[in-house]
């Protein structure tokens, strides 16, 4: 069948998810590109847990998540609701900063070096996650 | 073996329609993306499409968007190429080609040629 | 869409003799290039992936370099079986585009 009832080589399996961790750069639309041909998304983050996770596989390295505000409000990629969900913003961010001189504002969210959270130009070419759930059907006991 | 066969190809007058099949083996096929690139008559290499391994995302050139439509049924590890409304410009010899992590393409049919002509 | 140039587009050289193929981007790829070797009549074949990363089986004799908009192809001496036309590719964004080619022939 095309139930994914175990992670991909060289993905890391972690509560019923797999991750993938670039070790390149691309802007973020290219990187949301690169883990839907994975049949994946751009990581979403929904708990303190998941998080330290994320954070301890991908150092102290600017690195997108799948949260953007591209079309007006924030939205993560596989539709998970961004105002009851986790947040790990730094403090004063996110701040659609125009500052930094190379059109626009900052409508991309990155994990920063210290993990905590920033929005930045989404041309940047920062590493990224790529992240697929394991099959419901997969999770299910087996039948004696 | 790790091997990709093209077959389909052949003369079609413009407009009309083609599909091209790419038998694969050697390899979970399911687990990888694959890409059709083109090569017209003394040119060089043009990518044309991609389909993630499951088949949930696929990619077109702008040059075929809206006219190919790229397939694959995992159930016989066969990609597909469907071509629409061929043009002139559609010549070329059609090859299947498997997708890495880095976006290369490692492994490559020996090629089908398509020849739009009335 | 990223333009990929190449140069030269051909180039005549002996058996034994070192060859340099460069590869530009129109911007920024950093380092997601691919080169590949097509000989008359057959199919692309991998030979460097990620600018810089020889591919299995290649011989060591080919070697990429590069990052950002500037890659370069190099082969340290040249074999019989290596007279074919090199391409590169950027692999960083759709479209993925390919250079034009350079053909390496026999002087």
């Known amino acids: 069948g095309s139930e994914r009832t175990c992670c991909p080589v060289n993905w890391v399996e972690h509560e019923r998810s797999c991750y993938w961790f670039s070790r390149s750069g691309k802007a973020w639309a290219d990187a949301d590109n690169y883990c839907r041909l994975e049949d994946a998304h751009l990581v979403v983050v929904t708990s303190w847990e998941e998080q330290k996770f994320v954070q301890h596989h991908i150092g102290p390295v600017n690195t997108w998540m799948g949260l953007h505000d591209q079309n007006g409000p924030w939205k993560w990629v596989d539709g998970t609701d961004y105002e009851t969900g986790f947040k790990n913003w730094r403090p004063e961010q996110p701040d659609d900063w125009y500052g930094h001189g190379l059109g626009g504002g900052e409508d991309c969210a990155h994990f920063t070096d210290d993990g905590r959270w920033n929005d930045d130009v989404c041309q940047r070419p920062y590493r990224w996650v790529c992240e697929t759930e394991l099959d419901k059907a997969s999770q299910e006991p087996p039948l004696l | 073996e790790v091997q990709l066969l093209e077959s389909g190809g052949g003369l079609v007058q413009p407009g009309g329609s083609l599909r091209l099949s790419c038998a694969a083996s050697?390899?979970?096929?399911?687990?990888?993306?694959m890409s059709w690139v083109r090569q017209a008559p003394g040119k060089g290499l043009e990518w044309v499409s991609v389909?993630?391994?499951?088949?949930?995302?696929?990619y077109y050139a702008d040059s075929v968007k809206g006219r190919f439509t790229i397939s694959r049924d995992n159930s016989k590890n066969t990609l597909y190429l469907q071509m629409n409304s061929l043009r002139a410009e559609d010549t070329a010899v059609y090859y299947c080609?498997?997708?890495?992590?880095?976006?290369?393409?490692?492994?490559w049919g020996q090629g089908t040629m398509v020849t739009v002509s009335s | 869409d990223i333009q990929m140039t190449q140069s030269p587009s051909s180039v005549s050289v002996s058996v034994g003799d070192r060859v340099t193929i460069t590869c530009r981007a129109s911007?920024?790829?950093?380092?997601?290039l691919a080169w590949y070797q097509q000989r008359p009549g057959k199919a692309p074949k991998l030979l460097i992936y990620?600018?810089?990363s020889l591919e299995s089986g290649v011989p060591s004799r080919f070697s990429g370099s590069g990052s950002g908009t500037d890659f370069t192809l190099t082969i340290s001496s040249l074999q019989p079986e290596d007279f074919a036309t090199y391409y590169c590719?950027?692999?960083?964004?759709?479209?993925?585009?390919f250079g034009p080619g350079t053909k390496v022939d026999i002087k």
């Open positions: 050697g390899f979970t096929f399911n687990s990888y993306a």
């Open positions: 990620a600018a810089s």
């Open positions: 590719q950027q692999a960083n964004s759709f479209p993925f585009t």
């Open positions: 911007q920024d790829i950093s380092d997601w």
């Open positions: 389909i993630s391994g499951r088949g949930g995302t696929t």
């Open positions: 080609a498997k997708r890495t992590p880095s976006d290369a393409f490692d492994i």
